[in-house]
Amino acid sequence: LIIGFGISGRHSITVTTVASAGNIGEDGILSCTFEPDIKLSDIVIQWLKEGVLGLVHEFKEGKDELSEQDEMFRGRTAVFADQVIVGNASLRLKNVQLTDAGTYKCYIITSKGKGNANLEYKTGAFSMPEVNVDYNASSETLRCEAPRWFPQPTVVWASQVDQGANFSEVSNTSFELNSENVTMKVVSVLYNVTINNTYSCMIENDIAKATGDIKVTESEIKRRSHLQLLNSKAS
């Protein structure tokens, strides 16, 4: 969490941002809140990006003002106009690209004063893994697949019964480049699986950590998946 204050002039307002991660090819949110004002026409929101000459987005006098918008953001940004009055300056970003990563500044002017806060935005690809029993294999085998990751993640297998065991000798992980030539499909195979056990396939890079669990018993198979972003820090 980053909390910034206006430093020029006598009046300052609190602006709060939250570091976040964008999944490339999908929409992202750059979070920013501020002390609200009574009149929408008195609020100015400016989003800037370090190293970019033009603005990312500007909202003032109750409407978007994009004449100074940088070319890389054209047609890709929007504020939640109906929520500006209650202090939400968050920015929606369409079709996140790797190049959108960087340091952003949310700069606010209201009748109460000015304030700004920075936001670190990481970009990459992350997806939920699915673990299945591989019935085509000669021995009991589990197959963990996740369709989109970038940068290349690490894959670690764990088991509830054999806690702390190292499965690297009995697993094989491959990375297959997807058609857009950036993200990769992750496939990891675990051999010599025993029944009445719960296995976890953990995929992690510097942006996200995802886990796919499978419980294998004689009578049933239960699956569960979980994904967690690693860099959600507020400023």
Epitope: E26, K63, S67, Q69, D70, R74
Partner: antibody
């Protein structure tokens, strides 16, 4: 309310250029991009290009060599010019505005300019 | 270029029937699909944006759904005034593209 009004010729000689003006009201050209779309007789819609609030443009690659879109913010006018027209450019040409700055759909359309390319 | 394929090309329905129009994208377009109604001699009118958001003033019998590559426009109970061409389009990536349209006729 928001309106887009088109003006331009109905008949263009082969190999000549087409110029259409789209005059908007009810919103500022510094807030929204304006798209250009055409519809050939009995055919679907075809996106031609866009001019953004900043004045930057994006064109359909199929038309990039002969299409120019410009604007005058103070007059709330967008100018569409396509060169070297042929018979298969006969179509209704529309200007349109997005529903949001993030381009999720074209909410407001001009009345269309029927352009016939014929000698 | 992303190809938007609409089906069927045309259909004839009776008043009160449920109508389902399909639009398939050749690659992932997220939820950046919009649906338009075009009556003879008129400009297209926006019905649905962002795949499922009904535009202001559009009757609630029109519903959009889908994401990624498969999208649907449903008219829950078709009315005589729904006679029109229906177009889907994607605004996910350049060039923006449209389907070839579905002609809806009323029996």
């Amino acid at each position: 309310q928001i309106q887009l009004q088109q003006s331009g010729p109905g008949l263009v000689q082969p190999s000549q250029s087409l110029s259409i003006t789209c005059t908007v009201s009810g919103f500022s050209l510094t807030s929204y991009g304006v798209q250009w779309v055409r519809q050939s007789p009995g055919k679907g819609l075809e996106w031609l290009g866009v001019i953004w609030s900043s004045g930057n443009t994006d064109y359909n690659a199929a038309f990039i060599s002969r299409l120019t879109i410009t604007k005058d913010n103070s007059k709330s006018q967008i100018f569409f010019k396509m060169n070297s027209l042929q018979a298969d450019d006969t179509a209704i040409y529309y200007c349109a505005r997005d529903i949001t700055t993030i381009v999720e759909g074209f909410a407001y359309w001009g009345q269309g300019t029927l352009v016939t390319v014929s000698a | 270029n992303i190809v938007m394929t609409q089906s069927p090309k045309s259909m004839s329905m009776s008043v009160g029937e449920r109508v389902t129009l399909s639009c398939k994208a050749s690659e992932n377009v997220g939820t950046y699909v919009s649906w338009y109604q075009q009556k003879p001699e008129q400009s297209p009118k926006l019905l649905i944006y962002g795949a499922s958001n009904r535009y202001t003033g559009v009757p609630d019998r029109f519903t959009g759904s889908g994401s990624a590559t498969d999208f649907t426009l449903t008219i829950s109970s078709v009315q005589a005034e729904d006679l029109a061409d229906y177009h889907c389009g994607q605004t996910y990536s350049y060039p923006f593209t449209f389907g070839s349209g579905t002609k809806l006729e009323i029996k």
